[in-house]
């Protein structure tokens, strides 16, 4: 579809500021009108964009999910960032929730990393240093964590 | 993952109408801007109109305006395309694609899902 094919049908609240695109695209903060003559701004706390683009609507913000806090509101140029609650963390390979961080390692291994809102606590074999990942078993001597508290920010969108 | 699940494609009559349904199972798509495309035989995908996260902006191919209304309803997780005054040149397969946003000109923007296609032919 070429880019003529393309007409006005844009409808944009009222207080929406408009300007013109730069080389057919629009700033961050704005998405292009569908005849693309106009940037349209994006409506704050609502959506956002983040780069210079040609986009037809802006992305909607995301909401930061129960156990989680949010460490920055969404503006028309930034998502929400969202962290995982004290005591839990978020995987890279199931970023769509918090888990609880273990409280303790198993028998024969020393905590060497605190419990963060992006990992887990982190167990070593006491003798050979080996990290060790995956379910704690039935703890026996645990090493309890405090968790820990520096932010990191994890933003999803979506 | 999101799945897209379409119906309500057939066989009509040019001047007729038709409503297409497209559902989303697996996760919600309230938080995707909604789109619709469709292909003939050795064309390229074409799009064919698009609706915000929220339902409150909509962009359409030229060829449809005036004709056709997408529309979505995020309780029930679905989006509509209703096409009236249909032509013969509507026959298409068309799909429904979910995605961040699109772009000017039709192309999905970041995270996109597509659905498995349904089939209008619009006859003489």
């Known amino acids: 579809i070429t880019q003529q094919d393309l007409a006005p049908q844009q409808r944009a609240a009222p207080q929406q500021k408009r300007s013109s695109p730069s080389e057919g695209l629009c700033p961050p903060g704005h998405h292009i009108s569908e005849d693309g003559r106009d940037c349209i701004s994006c409506k704050y706390g609502q959506d956002y964009s983040t780069h210079w683009n040609d986009l037809l609507f802006c992305l909607r913000c995301t909401r930061c999910d129960s156990g989680e806090v949010e460490l920055s509101p969404c503006t028309t140029t930034r998502n929400t960032v969202c962290q995982c609650e004290e005591g839990t963390f978020r995987e890279e390979d199931s970023p769509e929730m918090c888990r609880k961080c273990r409280t303790g390692c198993p028998r024969g291994m020393v905590k060497v990393g605190d419990c963060t809102p992006w990992s887990d606590i982190e167990c070593v074999h006491k003798e050979s240093g080996t990290k060790h990942s995956g379910e704690v078993p039935a703890v026996e001597e645990t090493v309890t964590s405090s968790p820990g508290t520096p932010a990191s920010p994890c933003s999803l969108s979506g | 993952q999101v799945q897209l699940v379409q119906s309500g494609g057939g066989l009509v009559q040019a001047g007729g109408s038709l409503r297409l349904t497209c559902t989303a199972s697996g996760r919600t798509v309230s938080n995707y801007a909604m789109g619709w495309f469709r292909q003939t035989p050795g064309k390229d995908r074409e799009f064919v109109a698009a609706?915000?996260?929220?339902?409150?902006?909509?962009s359409y191919a030229d060829s449809v305006r005036g004709r056709f209304t997408i529309s979505r309803d995020n309780t029930r997780n679905t989006v509509y395309l209703q096409m009236d005054s249909l032509k013969r040149e509507d026959t298409a397969v068309y799909y429904c694609?979910?995605?961040?946003?699109?772009?000017?000109?039709?192309?999905?923007?970041?995270?996109?899902?597509w659905g498995q296609g349904t089939q209008v032919t619009v006859s003489s």
């Open positions: 694609a979910a995605a961040q946003s699109f772009r000017r000109g039709g192309a999905p923007y970041g995270d996109n899902y």
């Open positions: 609706l915000n996260w929220s339902g409150d902006t909509t």
